[in-house]
């Protein structure tokens, strides 16, 4: 058993049929010694008396808010949550496996630049009685500070018969060094509590591996005289790290016909313009990627040929 | 060339070669998403590689003030990785095919380090740890880890030379 926060405790249980459970001793936070009784949740049934209460925690029915009273007055509370371990593996019932980039990916994170700011998100089908808390650091043995905000519900989607909820959190490394080569990964830890179930999820990454630039901005076409060719130009996204002579991007320019089956013409360039042939009813799209490190491509910025 | 007197390197040549290094480092070890390197009792085997750190002057301001600190750091790293790529970790089994990008990568690391340091001038280099794996699969693990950290190292080096070529070239 360990303390998650003041008056909230997590009991770690091996979860299998007829498991013996864990013996837990609760102590009433009071100078009083006599006349103390204990109840669980809203029930008025007295579970025991005395300054300490010993319970055998085996299942969710044994978890909840234990309260010690004296003469109708509440003295203190202890909330017990359960953390299940099945076949040596901690349960992951609360969050959905996003399966990208690999199985057992519960947290996904992205950064728009090298400033040390990043966003993580996760999915669940649970709509109520759900809380999250997020901690992060650079490295684990001698951790350096990363400050995370509160997790918020950022999207709701309908998937078949189910509703899916996306939560996200923004974090910022306290003393980021954008030009340095990271040697210690960022660690992100999410505590999830649903009713009386506790779970924790972790992710470890380098900012360089989660970089995904915003799409190029101000995408414009300039027809070239007496030609089907156009000059496409664009700019670095505002959110990208500066100076651009140091934090350089590379670009992919694509000409795509109306039909998805039509052949796509692609050009790669380090410049912020390119000359392409504009077909009727086609669109021109541009996306960006770090020039020197193969992290994710941005989403496409597009304009119609016409 | 970065010579003892502190004169400028051939920024544009360094830029071109460092960008080539980036391409080679990624072709030698593309992102293999289904490989879980942590599964193999992942002791930190590549902790001793030289990293370009915050105080090494490789940021735009540091380069403007005095690029020599940064160039020395990059040179150290290039020599270190060149030695690693020429060691038993990469020459042993399972053997890399002759057309593997690792061969070109090895030669390009040497080429860039020579551009930075002409014959006759010696910056001190970092000792290469003796990592001789007893099992061939450990060699494979080390290769992947070394190439991953090399990708990060050459990315920073390429940014330095691109910025130098754009802003510090005479």
């Amino acid at each position: 058993i360990w303390e998650l926060k003041k008056d909230v405790y997590v009991v770690e249980l091996d979860w299998y049929p007829d498991a013996p459970g864990e013996m837990v001793v609760l102590t009433c936070d009071t100078p009083e010694e006599d006349g103390i009784t204990w109840t669980l949740d809203q029930s008025s049934e007295v579970l025991g008396s005395g300054k300490t209460l010993t319970i055998q925690v085996k299942e969710f029915g044994d978890a909840g808010q234990y309260t010690c009273h004296k003469g109708g007055e509440v003295l203190s509370h202890s909330l017990l949550l359960l953390h299940k371990k099945e076949d040596g593996i901690w349960s992951t019932d609360i969050l959905k496996d996003q399966k990208e980039p690999k199985n057992k990916t519960f947290l996904r994170c992205e950064a728009k630049n090298y400033s040390g700011r990043f966003t993580c998100w996760w999915l669940t089908t649970i709509s109520t009685d759900l809380t999250f808390s997020v901690k992060s650091s650079r490295g684990s043995s001698d951790p350096q500070g990363v400050t995370c905000g509160a997790a918020t519900l950022s999207a709701e989607r309908v998937r078949g018969d189910n509703k899916e909820y996306e939560y996200s959190v923004e974090c910022q490394e306290d003393s980021a060094c954008p030009a340095a080569e990271e040697s210690l990964p960022i660690e992100v830890m999410v505590d999830a509590v649903h009713k009386l179930k506790y779970e924790n999820y972790t992710s470890s990454f380098f900012i360089r591996d989660i970089i995904k630039p915003d799409p190029p901005k101000n995408l414009q076409l300039k027809p070239l005289k007496n030609s089907r060719q156009v000059e496409v130009s664009w700019e670095y996204p505002d959110t990208w790290s500066t100076p651009h002579s140091y934090f350089s991007l590379t670009f992919c320019v694509q000409v795509q016909g109306k039909s998805k089956r039509e052949k796509k013409d692609r050009v790669f360039t380090d410049k912020t313009s390119a000359t392409v042939i504009c077909r009727k009813n086609a669109s021109i799209s541009v996306r960006a990627q770090d020039r020197y490190y193969s992290s994710s491509w941005s989403e496409w910025a597009s304009v119609p040929c016409s | 060339r970065a010579v003892p007197g502190g004169s400028s390197p051939a920024w544009t040549q360094c830029q071109q070669l460092s960008q080539k290094l980036c391409t080679l480092a990624w072709s030698a070890h593309p992102l293999v998403g289904h490989m879980d390197l942590r599964e193999e009792g992942d002791e930190e085997t590549t902790n001793d590689v030289p990293h370009i750190q915050c105080g090494d002057g490789c940021d735009p301001q540091g380069l403007r003030d005095n690029s020599q600190f940064c160039l020395q750091r990059i040179h150290q790293g290039l020599i270190f990785y060149e030695k690693l790529l020429g060691s038993d970790i990469f020459t042993g089994e399972p053997s890399l095919l002759p057309d593997s990008p690792v061969g070109q990568l090895h030669a390009s690391l040497l080429g860039l380090s020579q551009l930075l340091q002409p014959e006759g001038h010696h910056w001190e280099t970092q000792q290469i740890p003796s990592l001789s794996p007893s099992q061939p699969w450990q060699r494979l693990l080390l290769r992947f880890k070394i190439l991953r950290s090399l990708q990060a190292f050459v990315a920073v080096a390429a940014r330095v030379f691109a910025h130098g070529a754009a802003t510090l070239s005479p």
């Epitope: - | 193999e40 089994e93 399972p94 494979l140 693990l141």
Partner: antibody, heavy 126, light 111 residues
């Protein structure tokens, strides 16, 4: 075509040594390793060790506790396996096999004993 | 050393029927979760062994009635429709850790 031709059968006394040769032809000798595997009469296969002429690396089965020495002569494309302090339980057919052990982006860990010698019967008897 | 345990020791199957051979390693012989360092060899009487399955890949020239599966510690070689020429002893071999080790062999016969 690829061929591995082993030296002939040997009868040895306990405590003595035997040196079996394996001459390779039909491929670039230094691009592959040579593995030695033995098979006692009516028994299974036992890996003894392998040598890679290009890297100079040799891997041994510690079970043989320094009794086995595997070498290669690049000039004649011949591999050798010497087993010392022979005992009756060393009676077996000794095979050499070409070992391809490569790493590519597509196949990061490809290992094949793809061509085998005809085998050399070594009999240890007093 | 990694111990490779094959089962059954011998197997009699009718022509055209399926034959399944198992190989269990005393510790994982996959690398990075996905690369198999487990191989299958076929040995006919009086001949040296012949490679039939390399990691997760059927060797070229080997009929596609042979298939290999498994990961971690448990592996299987399946002959979907046994032919007369498949009568042999089959060995698994791990080359994750030196010393490389063979299984004890499974003799496949026609019932």
């Amino acid at each position: 075509q690829v061929q591995l031709v082993q030296s002939g059968a040997e009868v040895k006394k306990p405590g003595s040594s035997v040196k079996v040769s394996c001459k390779a032809s039909g491929y670039t000798f230094t691009s592959y390793g040579i593995t030695w595997v033995r098979q006692a009469p009516g028994q299974g296969l036992e890996w003894m060790g392998e040598n890679y002429p290009r890297s100079g690396n040799t891997y041994y089965n510690e079970k043989f506790k320094g009794r086995v020495t595997i070498t290669a002569d690049k000039s004649t494309s011949t591999a050798y396996m010497e087993l010392s302090s022979l005992r009756s339980e060393d009676t077996a057919v000794y095979y050499c096999a070409r070992a391809e052990f490569i790493s590519t982006v597509v196949a990061p860990y490809y290992y094949a004993l793809d061509y085998w010698g005809q085998g050399t019967l070594v009999t240890v008897s007093s | 050393d990694i111990v490779m345990t094959q089962s059954p020791d011998s197997l009699a199957v009718s022509l055209g029927e399926r034959a399944t051979i198992n190989c269990k390693a005393s510790k994982k012989v996959t690398i990075f979760g996905s690369i198999s360092a487990l191989h299958w060899y076929q040995q006919k009487p009086g001949q040296p062994p012949k490679l039939i399955y390399n990691g997760a890949k059927l060797e070229s020239g080997v009929p596609d009635r042979f298939s290999g599966s498994g990961s971690g510690t448990d592996f299987t070689l399946t002959i979907s429709s046994l032919q007369a020429e498949d009568v042999a002893v089959y060995y698994c071999l791990q080359n994750k850790e030196v010393p490389y080790t063979f299984g004890g062999g499974t003799k496949v016969e026609i019932k």
